[in-house]
């Protein structure tokens, strides 16, 4: 039989964007495999990613059942083949993850400007409502469906000819701003959840500039 002992997983890390949630850990396995379990604070341990040699496990299916719950995962290490185990009295080696509350911690993905429409001195900018893997009644919910008014968007906009930025905020997915007629503007948006203490802001959307064949223009 082998002499390489099994080792416990370490550096358990949650990677989550728009509720797509993956647990990652180290080390790359040598003569061992992993099984992951996930639980809510009050719930039972559910095994996932059985006997895997991967060092990540997609737990999205479990956390989307209730994104406001707090989850804990643990990674078990089992010897592969005829390798001795270091677990005492037959107890398997495992390591716990940090707690993870999807609603409070999932990263908000980079928003996308869906379209803009100019009418005289008014410019309407619409942010695409990203879909998540959270389901209700067999349909996938959008970020807005999940976060409601907790989610706001900040619009940064400026004249193409200058660098002075202005900002606007909305708790819907639309901005209606005053602009100078005949001027071209550039803008980007950022998603923000002001009530959060971590992961409050998304990265900025790609910059869009008027006159670059995006959206609909009306004089």
């Amino acid at each position: 039989s082998g002499t390489t002992n099994t080792v416990a997983a370490y550096n358990l890390t949650w990677k989550s964007t728009n509720f797509k949630t993956i647990l990652e850990w180290e080390p790359k396995p040598v003569n061992q495999v992993y099984t992951v379990q996930i639980s809510t604070k009050s719930g039972d341990w559910k095994s996932k990613c059985f006997y895997t040699t991967d060092t990540e496990c997609d737990l999205t299916d479990e956390i989307v059942k209730d994104v406001k719950q707090t989850y804990l995962a643990r990674v078990f290490s089992y010897p592969a083949g005829n390798v001795e185990s270091t677990g005492s009295a037959g107890e398997p080696l495992y390591e716990n993850s940090p707690e993870f509350t999807p609603y409070l911690e999932t990263n908000i993905g980079q928003p996308v400007i869906q379209k803009y429409e100019q009418g005289g001195t008014k410019l309407k900018v619409t942010v695409k409502d990203s879909f998540t893997l959270v389901r209700r009644n067999n349909t996938f919910l959008s970020l807005r469906d999940v976060f409601g008014k907790d989610l706001i968007y900040t619009l940064y906009y400026w004249k193409s000819s200058s660098s002075g930025k202005k900002t606007a905020k909305t708790n819907t997915n639309e901005f209606l701003i005053d602009v100078d007629k005949g001027e071209n503007y550039c803008f980007s948006v950022q998603a923000v959840i002001p009530s959060r203490t971590v992961n409050r802001k998304s990265t900025d959307s790609p910059v869009e500039c008027m006159g670059q064949e995006k959206g609909e223009f009306r004089e």
Epitope: D44, K46, S47, F50, Y51, T53, A80, G81
Partner: antibody
């Protein structure tokens, strides 16, 4: 159709080894775990271990650690289970069983017909 | 190892009867439990996976449910072809373990 065909019955002496084969057909061999389960005469089912055909990684029940070796030959879509240092209590029917899809990853949805191994002096 | 205590070990019922078998796990196994049917001289056959999901092609008279660490397997109306031994199996913890089996006979 999907099936697992096992090798024939074996009679072995105590202390010897036995190697049972299980040939898979009708599905993508590498995509499903394969398990070995045994059943002593008139007794219940006992899980022995698992092999991942795509990488050949194995995990065994502690009871069989050091005595069992599971291997696979991807060219023939065949898995093997070798049990050494046989004793009379190893007399049993040995089954290979396919692990189910990701939905039911550790449910055994397809079984071989079984191989009777008799250990007798 | 997780112990799966299956009861009764045997039962006798009439055709058309409702038959219930229980399996109790020695600790919480979530819904990671499967049920199998084994007829004499044959390999087992998967009937129910994840406690309550019917395997494709299995008659709807078979069903499964869970309450905590207690799992129930039900045949709503026993048929002659249901004469077999039934096993539960947990896969939430290594090693995978089976219940001791329940032999179902016709009265």
């Amino acid at each position: 159709q999907v099936q697992l065909v096992q090798s024939g019955a074996e009679v072995k002496k105590p202390g010897a080894s036995v190697k049972v084969s299980c040939k898979a057909s009708g599905y993508t061999f590498a995509n499903y775990y394969m398990h070995w389960v045994r059943q002593a005469p008139g007794q219940g089912l006992e899980w022995m271990g698992i092999i991942n055909p795509s990488g050949g990684i194995t995990v065994y029940a502690q009871k069989f650690q050091g005595r069992v070796t599971m291997t696979r030959d991807t060219s023939t879509s065949t898995v093997y289970m070798e049990l050494s240092s046989l004793r009379s209590e190893d007399t049993a029917v040995y089954y290979c069983a396919r692990g189910g899809s990701k939905v039911a990853a550790l449910a055994f949805d397809i079984w071989g017909q079984g191989t009777m191994v008799t250990v007798s002096s | 190892d997780i112990q799966m205590t299956q009861s009764p070990s045997s039962l006798s019922a009439s055709v058309g009867d409702r038959v219930t078998i229980t399996c109790q796990a020695s600790q919480d196994i979530s819904n990671s439990l499967n049920w199998y049917q084994q007829k004499p001289g044959k390999a087992p056959k998967l009937l129910i996976y994840d406690a309550s999901n019917l395997e494709t092609g299995v008659p709807s008279r078979f069903s499964g449910s869970r309450s905590g660490t207690d799992f129930t397997f039900t045949i709503s109306s026993l048929q002659p072809e249901d004469i077999a031994t039934y096993y539960c199996q947990q896969y939430n913890f290594h090693p995978l373990t089976f219940g001791g089996g329940t032999k179902v006979e016709i009265k």
